[in-house]
Amino acid sequence: MAVTACQGLGFVVSLIGIAGIIAATCMDQWSTQDLYNNPVTAVFNYQGLWRSCVRESSGFTECRGYFTLLGLPAMLQAVRALMIVGIVLGAIGLLVSIFALKCIRIGSMEDSAKANMTLTSGIMFIVSGLCAIAGVSVFANMLVTNFWMSTANMYTGMGGMVQTVQTRYTFGAALFVGWVAGGLTLIGGVMMCIACRGLAPEETNYKAVSYHASGHSVAYKPGGFKASTGFGSNTKNKKIYDGGARTEDEVQSYPSKHDYV
């Protein structure tokens, strides 16, 4: 029961995380114009991974895509790559984890196979979350570096006569969305890995012990559940002794988590 809950919760948390990573990647507000002490500005600049936008006090907003690929900074390309890798891994992880969910029955899929898939999706979620966190952090670092550089050169001009105010950029909403989403995906992945450990029952191979009675030679094999210690075990989970306990498979199934997506 706890394993199913952990797995289901891990799936939902990862799903929210990956949706957040996708949202952050698509958002235009990765960097926003620093407004200093002035909350109202006539021209407000903000930039995303794919385009830069300008919002005027008239309400008019104009966005322009970065139509060049080679002309873009290497750091921006790296951030794009990290976010895309994060999304792809997360999407594959979601697909795998759907089939791994205990509350979803697919033919006669064994617990060990589900455990394998749960671990695989968990690892994918962890890597996906790390990619997103890394991508957002690289971009944030780039912003901090540029912020202090532009602060140092805040006013440039010819002989101090003409001032050119350099636009400084600070953290945009997408960065916070990305950090939170990456964290959620990471947590979801860890939960999936934890759930995986409890999915396949522990395989304790007891050696058959022979007890020699005075008369007859009777071999007595102590019963119990075969449990897998590893994730690669493909042995059938045969029950030799049933003392009235129910296996995980016999617990009532709950509405599948993906019904609510």
Epitope: S58, V162, Q163, T167
Partner: antibody
Amino acid sequence: EVQLVESGGGLVQPGGSLRLSCAVSGYTFSMNWVRQAPGKGLEWVAWINMYTGEPTYADDFKGRFTISRDDSKNTLYLQMNSLRAEDTAVYYCARTAPGNGFDYWGQGTLVTVSS
Amino acid sequence: DIQMTQSPSSLSASVGDRVTITCKSSQSLLNSGNQKSYLTWYQQKPGKAPKLLIYWASTLESGVPSRFSGSGSGTDYTLTISSLQPEDFATYYCQNAYSFPFTFGQGTKVEIK
């Protein structure tokens, strides 16, 4: 088609108050008040976001003038307090257009501050 | 605040003349985000409200005759009337549309010679 009609101008004594209105028809995201003293140039007074009500003012008018709007009446206001003789001018309301220019203007309302 | 300085303050010209009015700002009006200069030009006739002619330094407002053109970037801008018409005799203002407070130039009065 946007139409702007100002009202509320008139004669007021120094230190007095006056509220100007601008009836707005048509789409406006943000609005401005601009004034022009007799024989002088244009002077921007204040701006307001018609959706959020967020205002900003020219330094000379902060604390004395208040720009506001009434959503239900689709009207823009300029509350002017502590009026001085130098506030005598024609006051225009104007809509902000792309490029932050003012594309639609009212006909103007004259405010005279005199004792 | 950004100061706007127009020159000349007045000029006399004849119909058909090419007229140039310059406007200088104390700070650059060029926005790095979209590479547009936030300078606006207006025409005002006596007793009337100003009329928008040009925004983004060079974009002609709809309905404005093509004889009007704007140019410039950074801190130096120009309004040109290629062939002055009788209805063009008026006062012209430039405006900083880049940052609050919006500021206007003192105006250039175009009179008949």
